[in-house]
Every structure is written in C-alpha cells, then in structure tokens.
Amino acid sequence: EKAMVDGSWLDLAKRSKLEAQPFAHLTINATDIPSGSHKVSLSSWYHDRGWAKISNMTFSNGKLIVNQDGFYYLYANICFRHHETSGDLATEYLQLMVYVTKTSIKIPSSHTLMKGGSTKYWSGNSEFHFYSINVGGFFKLRSGEEISIEVSNPSLLDPDQDATYFGAFKVRDID
C-alpha cells in the first residue's frame, strides 16, 4: 500500500511539474495586421482564443516573455497569400521573410534567433499565390527575455489561425 501511495505521489508530482511547464501558442490577430512592404514587427496576436493558448509565459506589447529559465523549442509558421479579388500586386518580385527575434531587457540587446523565407516571382497572370515559411529551433532562454516576430510584406499575410502563428515550449531546465 505504501509503495502504491508513493507511486501515486510520484505521478502527481510529475503531472504538476508537466502542468507547470511553460508553453505558448499564439495566433495572428487578423483585425490588426500592420501595412507596409518593408520589415515590420507583428505585435497583435491572440493568446486565448481558438487554437491559441498560453501557460506560465506572458504575452505583452506584442512580445512573448519568458518567465522561467530553460531550454525552449521556439517555432513560427507564416503564410503569405494573394488572390486577385483584392487587387493587383504592385510588384511581382517579392521577398517574403520571417525573423524570430530575442530581446534582452537586462543587457539591452536584440538577436535574430531564426529567419526563413525566399524571394518569389508572383506573376500577375495567376489568380492565386501562396507561400508558407516554417522555422523552429532549440534555444536557451532566461527569465525576462522577449520573443518577437518580424515579417516582410505584412499586407500579404494569411490571417487564419492555422496559417500564421508562433509559439514556444520549455523542454528542460538549465543545469
């Protein structure tokens, strides 16, 4: 019986540790996508509706803030699209990019952790164009550090929650 009690306590401890593991999955706020054809920061994301969720991390001022030191897996998926019903592209040669950036408040500095994308030729003869970028990586993050997303050509972003999103989850502690 004692062994069983010990075992269930162990399960509970494991479960609560897992439940305390920080994670976030943020989806684009389609009502507030900035305009521009140059690199812009995406600051409006959902954290509590649809697929979006957050736990033991903070979302503030367009940035995902780390609350616990640790090794995290960061990911971002950005979809760009254009359909002729919205008009014509002013230029057919496009650089479609995403940048995942880490900002440290303690030692004011900013680093691009990941970038992805391509130059594209989206011909005016086609009715529809689509391009998707997915980046992911394993990073040591400290409490207080902030993760943000920058993209080129935000007016071409696909605003669906299954298309444009980013997130993080803690994988292990820093030894």
Partner: antibody, heavy 126, light 103 residues
Framework: QVQLVQSGAEVRKPGASVKVSCKAS????????IHWVRQAPGQRLEWMGW????????KFSQKFQGRITVTRDTAASTAYMELRSLRSEDTAVYYC???????????????????WGQGTLVTVSS | EIVMTQSPSSLSASVGDRVTITCRAS??????LNWYQLKPGKAPRLLIY???SLQSGVPSRFSGSGSGAEFTLTISSLQPEDIATYYC?????FGQGTKVEIK
C-alpha cells in the same frame, strides 16, 4: 489638396495615335499608382490599365494590350497614356484616377480610385 | 472575368426619398466593391469603398452594404445634388450604371 489635371480635348483620324497627360499635385506622386479608365458614349466605365508611379510597373486590360502605352515622369509628377491605331469606337472620355493604396504602406493596388482627373474627350473621326 | 450587373438602369424619385441601387457580381468578391458618382463634365467621385466604408467628405446619407456577390448603395434622403449616374466597381469591372433623376 490632391488634384489630377488632364490635358485638353483631342480630335484624331482613324489609325492615328493620341497621348493624354495627367498632372498630379498635392501628394507624393511616386507613392501611388495611376489608373486609366474611359467611358464611350452610352457605355459603362471601362478600365484600361495602371502604372505604379514609383517603379514604372504597368498592367493593361487584355482589350488594349499592344495598343496602349502608359508612362510617367516622376520629376513632373505626370502620367501619360498613349493609345495607338485609333478607331471610331475609341471615341470616349478618358480619365486618369489615383489608386488609394500608398505604396509605402502596402503593395496591393486595390482599385479604389480616390481621386480622378476631369476627363479628356478624344474624338476619332474621319 | 467577373461581370458586374446593376439594377435598375434608371430611376426617378422625389427629394427626401430613400433610394436603393443593387449591384451583383458574377461570383463572390468578398467585400471588394466600390461605388462612384458621375456627373456630366465633372470628375467621378468615390462614395463607398470596401462595400460599406464611406469615403472622406461624402455625406452620411450615402451608405453601402453587402458581401459575397450582392451589394447595395442607399441614399437615405435624396437631395437635388444627387442627380447623377452611379456605378459599382470591383477591380477591373464596372457595372453598367444607374441614372438617378428627380421626379
């Protein structure tokens, strides 16, 4: 205030060419596209083509492809539309119109014509 | 190629009347629809863009609604200066126009 001022009325014989100008003022000419639209007597408005005043990119209606040239002079803030091999059916009022999209903020030419020229009557008659 | 169809082609109404013009697209165009006013010898004027957004400087008696393939322009209280031909437009395609006259 934003203004588009077009050149005066023209009379041409069939087979000839005409070049209509559209002078812009009151905004940064290079940041917007200019469209050309015409209206023949008793007909609906008809889109002809656009030019991105910033980079000179153009797009034309299939109907006018090969007969139309649209250019711009950024220093003079002026767009030009030349139509060649004129026929009597080309008798119309020709308008230039500004696209509402500021190219600094976006790259989609949205076809919202927020300012128009006063129109240029082109008569094609033998 | 999308075709825009307006109805009626002309109408006559009294000052103060509510006037409604309909525009249909041959396929769904979301909310990418604009309305223009044309008066003879004058530059055309953008009234409504994006189906329902009122262009700056346009009187509030003009309003637009609809999405998909069916749209309407409404003049809530017709004024003498509203005598004109009204056109709907989606990108490269225009409707055939509706001529509005005063009774």
């Amino acid at each position: 205030q934003v203004q588009l001022v077009q050149s005066g009325a023209e009379v041409r014989k069939p087979g000839a060419s005409v070049k209509v100008s559209c002078k812009a003022s009151g905004y940064d000419f290079s940041n917007y596209a200019i469209h050309w639209v015409r209206q023949a007597p008793g007909q609906r408005l008809e889109w002809m083509g656009w030019i991105n005043a910033g980079n000179g990119n153009t797009k034309f209606s299939q109907k006018f492809q090969g007969r139309i040239t649209v250019t711009r002079d950024t220093a003079a803030s002026t767009a030009y539309m030349e139509l060649r091999s004129l026929r009597s059916e080309d008798t119309a009022v020709y308008y230039c119109a500004r696209d509402s999209t500021n190219m600094v903020r976006g790259i989609i030419i949205a076809y919202y014509f927020d300012y128009w020229g006063q129109g240029t009557l082109v008569t094609v008659s033998s | 190629e999308i075709v825009m169809t307006q109805s009626p082609s002309s109408l006559s109404a009294s000052v103060g009347d509510r006037v409604t013009i309909t525009c249909r697209a041959s396929q769904s165009i979301s909310r990418y629809l604009n309305w223009y006013q044309l008066k003879p010898g004058k530059a055309p004027r953008l009234l409504i863009y994006g189906a329902s957004s009122l262009q700056s400087g346009v009187p509030s008696r003009f309003s637009g609604s609809g999405s998909g393939a069916e749209f309407t322009l409404t003049i809530s209280s017709l004024q003498p200066e509203d005598i004109a031909t009204y056109y709907c437009q989606h990108t490269r395609a225009f409707g055939q126009g509706t001529k509005v006259e005063i009774k």
